[in-house]
């Protein structure tokens, strides 16, 4: 019987540790996409509606803030699209990029952790264009560090929650 109790307690301990594991999945706020044709920071994301969720991490001022030291898997998916009903592209040669950036407040510094994208020729003869970028990687993050997303040509972002999102989840502690 003691073994049973111990086993249940271990399960409970494991489960509560898992539940405390930080994670975030943030989806683009389509009502507040910035304008610009060069690299801009995306600061408006949902964290509590639709597919978006956050636990033991903080979302503030457009940045995902780490609350616990650890090794995290970071990911971002950015979709760009253009349909002729919205008008014409002023230029057919485009650089469509995403940058995942880490900012440290304690030692003021900023580093690009991941980038992805391509140059594209979106011909005016086509009715619809689409391009998707997915980046992901494993990083050591410290409490207080902030993760942010920058993109080129934000006016071409696909505003759907299944198209433009980013997130993180803790995989293990720092030994």
């Amino acid at each position: 019987e003691k073994a049973m109790v111990d086993g249940s307690w271990l399960d409970l301990a494991k489960r509560s540790k898992l539940e405390a594991q930080p994670f975030a999945h943030l989806t683009i706020n389509a009502t507040d996409i910035p304008s610009g044709s060069h690299k801009v920071s995306l600061s408006s994301w949902y964290h509590d509606r639709g597919w978006a969720k956050i636990s033991n991490m903080t979302f503030s001022n457009g940045k995902l803030i780490v609350n616990q030291d650890g090794f995290y898997y970071l990911y971002a998916n950015i979709c760009f699209r253009h349909h002729e009903t919205s008008g014409d592209l002023a230029t057919e040669y485009l650089q469509l990029m995403v940058y995942v950036t880490k900012t440290s407040i304690k030692i003021p510094s900023s580093h690009t952790l991941m980038k992805g994208g391509s140059t594209k020729y979106w011909s005016g003869n086509s009715e619809f264009h689409f391009y998707s970028i997915n980046v992901g990687g494993f990083f050591k993050l410290r409490s207080g560090e902030e993760i942010s997303i920058e993109v080129s040509n934000p006016s071409l972002l696909d505003p759907d929650q299944d198209a433009t999102y980013f997130g993180a989840f803790k995989v293990r502690d720092i030994d």
Epitope: G36, T85, T91
Partner: antibody, heavy 126, light 103 residues
Framework: QVQLVQSGAEVRKPGASVKVSCKAS????????IHWVRQAPGQRLEWMGW????????KFSQKFQGRITVTRDTAASTAYMELRSLRSEDTAVYYC???????????????????WGQGTLVTVSS | EIVMTQSPSSLSASVGDRVTITCRAS??????LNWYQLKPGKAPRLLIY???SLQSGVPSRFSGSGSGAEFTLTISSLQPEDIATYYC?????FGQGTKVEIK
Amino acid sequence: QVQLVQSGAEVRKPGASVKVSCKASGYDFSNYAIHWVRQAPGQRLEWMGWINAGNGNTKFSQKFQGRITVTRDTAASTAYMELRSLRSEDTAVYYCARDQSNMVRGIIIAYYFDYWGQGTLVTVSS
Amino acid sequence: EIVMTQSPSSLSASVGDRVTITCRASQSISRYLNWYQLKPGKAPRLLIYGASSLQSGVPSRFSGSGSGAEFTLTISSLQPEDIATYYCQHTRAFGQGTKVEIK
């Protein structure tokens, strides 16, 4: 304030060419596109083409392809539309219009014509 | 190619009347629809863009609504200076116009 001032009325014979100018003032000319739209007597407005004043990129209606040239002089903040091989059905009032989309803020030419020139009457008659 | 169809082609109303003009697109155009006012010998004027956004400087008696393929321009209280021809427009396509006159 934003103003588009067009050149004066023109009379041409069939087969000739005409070049209409559109001088912009009151805004940064290079940051916007200029469209050309015409209206023949008793007809609806008809879009002809646009020029991105910043990079000189152009797009034209299939109907005018091969007959139309649109250029710009950024130093003079002026756009030009030349129509060749004129026929009597080209008799119309020709307008230039600014696209509302600022090219610094995005790269979509949205076809919202927020400011227009006063129009230039081109008469094609033998 | 998208075709824009306006109705009616002309209308006559009294000062103070509520006037409604309809514009239909041959396929869905979301909310990418603009309205212009044209008076003889004057530069056209943008009234409404994006189906319902009032252009700066345009009197609030003008309003726009609709999405998809059906749109309306409403003048809540017709004024003598509103005598003009009104055009709807989606990108490269214009409606045939609606001439508004005073009774």
